[in-house]
């Protein structure tokens, strides 16, 4: 079981720990120069008790 691809964030690049996003995988978003990150920069894929695996947070935004 794995998390869905959390997607790209405009004005950022991302570092992924594993291409298929299994439980324990992380995605780190790094905003482009001049942009400020709003939200969590690192998401982790977690198992849930009833539902399918889910990211620890929503993807962030990179704002001017």
């Amino acid at each position: 079981t794995s998390c869905h691809d959390p997607g790209d964030v405009e004005h950022s690049r991302r570092l992924i720990s594993s291409p298929k996003f299994p439980v324990g995988a992380t995605v780190q978003y790094i905003c482009d120069q001049g942009f400020v990150l709003m939200g969590s920069s690192i998401l982790t894929c977690h198992d849930r008790q009833a539902g399918s695996p889910k990211w620890s947070d929503r993807a962030p935004k990179c704002l001017l």
Epitope: P22, V23, G24, T44, C45, H46, R48, Q49, A50, G51, S52, K54
Partner: antibody, heavy 116, light 112 residues
Framework: QVQLVQSGAEVKKPGASVKVSCKAS????????MHWVRQAPGQGLEWMGG????????VYNQKFKGRVTLTEDTSTSTAYMELRSLRSEDTAVYYC?????????WGQGTTVTVSS | DIVMTQSPDSLAVSLGERATINCKSS????????????LAWYQQKPGQPPKLLIY???TRESGVPDRFSGSGSGTDFTLTISSLQAEDVAVYYC????????FGQGTKLEIK
Amino acid sequence: QVQLVQSGAEVKKPGASVKVSCKASGYTFTDYEMHWVRQAPGQGLEWMGGIDPESDNTVYNQKFKGRVTLTEDTSTSTAYMELRSLRSEDTAVYYCTRGDWYFDVWGQGTTVTVSS
Amino acid sequence: DIVMTQSPDSLAVSLGERATINCKSSQSLLNSRTRENYLAWYQQKPGQPPKLLIYWASTRESGVPDRFSGSGSGTDFTLTISSLQAEDVAVYYCGQSYNLFTFGQGTKLEIK
């Protein structure tokens, strides 16, 4: 704002059933699991079970298995907890609470009194 | 089932002093894949539902005053209130979500 609003207090006789509702607003209902926790008078918190509104998958505390059923209606963003074969020890405040790994939003609680 | 045991059962602390509540789990709450401890702390005041204070053992929930902090890993966890305020009088619960959900028995915090 994110809110969980529960149905009103209930008084039931031993052996009867009760169904408590929990209406969610302010967020996408299917994005989070919904769990039920009860608290007997003067006692601590006891987890009863949870449901994933997206898949309808449920998990239950073994203590309540066979006596409790969790359901939901995504069209109205409402979760339900039905407890059957009520006994006096089921007298408690019943809470619905949103969360996947921790419970960040709670309903106001529904008092269920079981008395003959 | 994972059993959560809090200590002490009750605690009286002077205003402005530090309050420390401990929570011990019967098995480790550290997930080796996610590297997180599945442990949260809740505050409950009379007549109110519980309120989330801390999750992942040490992450403060948005809006919670920074006098509240959580620490620990594996089986031993601590909630610390660095400088007790009158509004902190409540019952505090730890809860685990490593395997289903269970709560500690609660710690009643009062003012000395």
